[in-house]
């Protein structure tokens, strides 16, 4: 009779991630007697999977009953397959001995290669906010796919990205890898509303690519401009200066006015205007009674922004324009919140 | 070389139920099987459950079949031997194995390395 050969007949088999594997293993004949063990790898290091005398199997399942008495189908089904579980499998004939049973026969083995989808992309940007004009990097970073080959893409509102830095990690072979991409983005006043996306495509995402996002909202700082104008009088000895506070982003900020040096009132933006850019405006007025000084008035408009260094823009009151009048070095009335008289 | 250092040991009344776990260090974790061997006073060092180096497969002695489960965690390197349904006769010194060959519950004489040992103590 002709010696028993074990047949594997699928050289490789590729399976998603989640799903069950099939690994097929058929005996030419019933002698010797013996028992089917599967394992992953050979050698002396090779794992058991399956034992056909004994163990707990969660995960595998005989596709025949191995009880039978003239069955020679020694197929199994492994579970919840993960790319933990890629690897070449065994199917191995024992002949019964004693005390030990002895490896009679190997098949040829099978690869079970697993497709794992990478997980949704993760964009963060810097830690802190950077100005127009300056350059900040974005990170984004997937894990957990297999097989090895991946491509990432960046994307600025649409338009692809060049310059960026790309590995996947590890080099050599391993179960599952990871990505990890840094671009860099060159910020203008325009990205209150620009978005940076990381796009990844893999075989497993069926043309259908994942993104990872980063709103530039969250990383720039458009510092204000400002312009300190006087205003026509609006009543006899009286003066409006405004400050206006143009385009700037976020809109955290805080106004100081400055008479000569001396801090005359202090408020922070409330009710903002916003451009289309998404930058903020913001005016805020003080009413000067020019009567009530000898010398010119220096008015300071101070601003703090987001935490940074104060910026200033200041305008000089010429009290000599206005001639003063009897009896009219009283305070004018307060004639709105953002209002101050100076005397 | 392989550590292993086993911890979860106690005193516990029959019926109750206790973890014990094993770290190890010094070799990559997912290349070992690993096992469970309890000693009981004056008795011989016995096999209670092995697991392979995936966890895909599991061995169990018979008296013990039902009522513990050996699970593992290659992230952590950790082996786990939950016991269940405590009975006085499961008193003993239990040691964390590991081998770099596993033959199902041939596991004894496949063991290269040995944990201390923790003390399990079920009264009644």
């Known amino acids: 009779e002709e010696e028993l050969q074990v047949i594997q007949p699928d050289k490789s088999v590729l399976v998603a991630a989640g799903e069950t594997a099939t690994l097929r293993c058929t005996a030419t004949s019933l002698i010797p007697v013996g028992p089917i063990q599967w394992f992953r790898g050979a050698g002396p290091g090779r794992e058991l999977i399956y034992n056909q005398k004994e163990g707990h199997f969660p995960r595998v399942t005989t596709v025949s009953d191995l009880t039978k008495r003239n069955n020679m189908d020694f197929s199994i089904r492994i579970g919840n397959i993960t790319p933990a579980d890629a690897g070449t499998y065994y199917c191995v004939k024992f002949r019964k001995g004693s005390p030990d049973d002895v490896e009679f026969k190997s098949g040829a083995g099978t690869e079970l290669s697993v497709r794992a989808k990478p997980s949704a992309p993760v964009v963060s940007g810097p830690a802190a906010r950077a100005t127009p004009q300056h350059t900040v990097s974005f990170t984004c970073e997937s894990h957990g796919f297999s097989p090895r080959d991946i491509t990432l893409k960046w994307f600025k509102n649409g338009n692809e990205l060049s310059d960026f830095q790309t590995n996947v990690d590890p080099v050599g072979e391993s179960v599952s890898y990871s990505i990890h991409s840094t671009a860099k983005v060159v910020l203008t006043r325009e990205d209150v509303h620009s978005q940076v996306i990381c796009e990844v495509a893999h075989v497993t995402l069926q043309g259908d690519p994942l993104r990872g996002t980063a709103n530039l909202s969250e990383t720039i700082r458009v510092p204000p401009t400002l312009e300190v104008t006087q205003q026509p009088v609006r009543a006899e000895n009286q003066v409006n200066v405004t400050c206006q506070v143009r385009k700037f982003y976020p809109q955290r900020l805080q106004l100081t006015w400055l008479e000569n040096g001396n801090v005359s009132r202090t408020e922070t933006a409330s009710t903002v205007t916003e451009n289309k850019d998404g930058t903020y405006n913001w005016m805020s007025w003080l009413l000067v009674n020019v009567s009530a000084h000898r010398d010119d008035v220096k008015l300071t408009c101070q601003v703090e922004h987001d935490g940074q260094p104060a910026v200033s823009k200041s305008h000089d009151l010429k009290v000599s324009a206005h001639p003063k009048e009897q009896g009219s070095n009283t305070a004018a009335e307060n004639t709105g919140s953002n209002e101050r008289n100076i005397y | 070389q392989v550590q292993l250092q086993e911890s979860g040991g106690g005193v516990v009344q029959a019926g109750d139920s206790l973890r014990l776990s094993c770290v190890a260090s010094?070799?990559?974790?997912?290349?070992?099987?690993m096992g469970w061997f309890r000693q009981a006073p004056g008795k011989e060092r016995e096999f209670v459950a092995g697991i392979s180096r995936s966890g895909i497969s599991q061995y169990y002695a018979d008296s013990m079949k039902g009522r513990f489960t050996i699970s593992r965690d290659n992230a952590k390197n950790l082996v786990y031997l939950q016991m269940n349904s405590l009975k006085p006769e499961d008193t003993a010194v239990y040691y964390c194995?590991?081998?770099?060959?596993?033959?199902?519950?041939?596991?004894?004489?496949?063991?290269?390395?040995w944990g201390q040992g923790t003390q399990v103590t079920v009264s009644s």
């Open positions: 010094g070799r990559t974790f997912s290349s070992l099987d």
């Open positions: 194995a590991a081998a770099l060959t596993f033959r199902g519950s041939d596991l004894p004489r496949d063991s290269n390395y």
